[in-house]
């Protein structure tokens, strides 16, 4: 038989299929020219020493065949001896190592078989009633197509699914989308009502990455507040790898999660901006205030579910960097100030509320008076910080208060508000013989005792009715008990404690009377 | 500069009195607050009880820790420049060496002291 003939003898091997996993597959014909036709295949399996032949049958039950050697590719023309205007039936069987194996037929008439070509360049995909929908150009003069697809997970085989029939410029293919893992995809043409056409190869990988965005497995951790009232967030972040199918392995577009961190200041909410968004490589800094940080994953179908975290707010106070004046008309507060054109946020609370009453007052813009101090003025009538009790009071500072990551906290400390002096006046003032000379004066805490760092300390006085002599001692603010001793009987004395602040005298308690009664010997 | 010699420790049985005296040399010592503190074995010192210094009145504002007040009473002399601690009632648990101490510090009834002498023990046995 010539080689360019479809030889019409017995193949020169057994005929004998081995049934083996190994063999051709995937064969393809298809007219390439007016007068020429080409069949292709794949092998699987060691290639060495196979030898592959393309078998054919007439519609008359006659068989021939072509030897192709090593090659997985025969080109023939129409005088080859194969019908090309009447259906025949195609399949290759390949010699290997004494034993045939033989690929799936494949049924058709090859004058009418074109080859069709999968879908080239960029395929879109988007996601459609909880479905994955692609989209892709019809390649040029292939208007007209059956479209399959197969997909598959990095667990799973390739399962196969169908698209429909196409007519149009542009085709489409409605596939289902996996909520949690990533997904491979491909997609493959065949000519349109050709009865038995081939199939095109198969296209290249589609990956395509779950509904749900995997979430990170995040840890923060926030440095301590620095001298420029500023503390670093940093994200101990280990981003979920998400395990790929084998095609979509190493550079995989379509399946990228990009994470984005979502700051919310929740402190001093009277500022303009509360929320910011940042890439979650860049590592902010914060002021000492609280803040919700949500961590955003993201992928080509949109946000995931956010994780929330909660940083408490920085409580270490400074008791003596403010400085709290009390006038008839108002209330006003010094600070050091932190720069030219500052912008400071005032927020207070009273103690032992929930922080969701806290109240904020925002300053214009302003400069260090020539003491180098900030101030915050407060009319009695606004009823800030009024009431006789203790507020915690934090001042917050931005050159750009638009800015949420440029906050800085200059200090927090308690301060009693309304009538302090007169409100820490310690009760309950009592006095109880101890000795012959001595006795124990015991008060209850003052208010002010309920602010830390607030009350300065008690001082005691004790005045001798007699000599009109007083004599004053201070006493620690933890402490609420002192004993007086070297009186002298038969003398009327009385005594009083007051509590003081940094900056406030307090008022003496009601004068308690007492006196040692003279011991009369028998 | 001011030295403090303590005297008058011993061993007693449980329920016995004993009275601590503290001898300190200086011009000032009236302007001195005093205290007493102790150490028992394998803890650190305490605080027992403070006496303040002299006032316009002569009356003088003393402290006890709660554990020994109304068994224990402090008093100074300025004019012999002593500190005594009276005990009485004692208990095993008031076994330590007992440290006088002296302070011109504005809080003075719990620490802050500046000079100290070297102890004397008291034992206390059941």
């Known amino acids: 038989c010539r080689t360019s003939e479809c030889c019409f003898q017995d193949p020169p091997y057994p005929d004998a299929d081995s049934g083996s996993a190994s063999g051709p597959r995937d064969l393809r014909c298809y007219r390439i020219s007016s007068d020429r036709y080409e069949c292709s295949w794949q092998y699987e399996g060691p290639t060495a020493g196979v030898s592959h032949f393309l078998r054919c049958c007439l519609s008359s039950g006659r068989c021939c065949y072509f030897a192709a050697g090593s090659a997985t590719r025969l080109q023939f023309s129409d005088q080859a001896g194969v019908s090309v205007l009447y259906t025949v039936t195609l399949w290759v069987e390949s010699w290997a190592r004494n034993q045939t194996e033989k690929s799936p037929e494949v049924t058709l008439q090859l004058y009418n078989s074109v080859k069709y070509e999968p879908p080239l360049g960029d395929i879109k995909v988007s996601k459609l009633a909880g479905q994955l929908r692609m989209e892709w150009e019809t390649p040029d003069n292939q208007v007209g197509a059956e479209v399959q697809f197969r997909h598959r997970t990095p667990s799973s085989p390739w399962k196969l699914g169908d698209c429909g029939p196409q007519d149009d410029d542009t085709e489409s293919c409605l596939c289902p989308l996996e909520m949690n893992v990533a997904q491979e995809f491909q997609l493959r043409r065949r000519q349109l009502g050709s009865q038995g056409s081939s199939w095109s190869k198969w296209s290249s990988p589609v990956c395509v990455p779950p509904e749900n965005p995997p979430q990170p497995q995040v840890r923060f951790s926030v440095e301590q507040l620095g001298q420029d009232g500023r503390r670093r967030l940093t994200l101990k972040e280990q981003p979920t790898q998400l395990e790929l199918p084998e095609g979509c392995q190493g550079l995989a577009p379509g399946t990228e999660v990009t994470y984005r961190l979502q700051l919310h200041m929740l402190s001093c909410p009277c500022k303009a901006k509360a929320t910011r968004t940042l890439h979650l490589g860049k590592m902010p800094y914060l002021s000492g205030a609280a803040y919700n940080v949500a961590v955003i994953s993201s992928n080509q179908f949109g946000p995931g579910l956010n994780q929330t975290w909660h940083i408490p707010a920085d409580t270490h106070t400074e008791p003596v960097a403010l400085n709290i004046s009390v006038g008839t008309n108002g209330t006003t507060m010094y600070w050091p100030a932190r720069a030219q054109s500052m912008t400071y946020c005032i927020e207070w609370q009273p103690v032992g509320q929930d922080g969701g009453l806290a109240t904020c007052s925002l300053t214009a813009p302003q400069d260090p008076d020539p003491a180098g101090m900030a101030t915050y003025s407060w009319s009695r009538e606004s009823g800030a910080m009024g009431q006789e009790k203790c507020y915690y009071i934090t001042i917050f500072a931005s050159a750009h208060p638009e800015k949420l990551t440029l906050w800085s906290t200059v200090l927090s400390t308690y301060h009693f508000g309304g009538n302090a002096s007169a409100a820490g006046t310690p009760h309950h003032v009592s006095v109880k013989n101890h000795s012959l000379d001595s006795v124990s004066v015991d008060w209850a805490p003052s208010l002010l005792s309920t602010c830390p760092g607030v009350l300065k300390e008690y001082v005691v006085r004790c005045r001798d009715e007699d000599s009109k002599q007083v004599s004053e001692h201070p006493v620690q603010p933890t402490e609420t008990q002192v004993t007086l001793s070297g009186l002298r009987a038969g003398v009327a004395y009385t005594v009083q404690v007051r509590a003081d602040t940094a900056w406030l005298r307090g008022v003496w308690s009601q004068p308690q009377r007492f006196s040692i009664e003279v011991q009369v010997s028998d | 500069q001011v030295q403090l010699v303590e005297s008058g420790g011993g061993l007693v049985q449980a329920g016995a009195s004993l009275r601590l005296s503290c001898a300190a040399s200086?011009?000032?010592?009236?302007?001195?607050?005093m205290g007493w503190f102790r150490q028992a074995p394998g803890k650190e010192r305490e605080f027992v009880a403070a006496i303040s210094g002299g006032t316009p009145n002569n009356i003088y504002y003393t402290n006890y820790k709660d554990a020994v007040r109304g068994r224990f009473t402090i008093s100074r002399d300025n004019a012999k420049n002593t500190v005594y601690l009276q005990m009485s009632s004692l208990k095993p648990e008031d076994t330590a060496v007992y440290y006088c101490?002296?302070?011109?510090?504005?809080?003075?009834?719990?620490?802050?002291?500046?000079?100290w002498g070297q102890g004397t023990q008291v034992t206390v046995s059941s």
């Open positions: 200086g011009r000032t010592f009236s302007s001195y607050a």
């Open positions: 101490g002296a302070t011109m510090g504005r809080y003075w009834n719990t620490g802050g002291y500046d000079y």
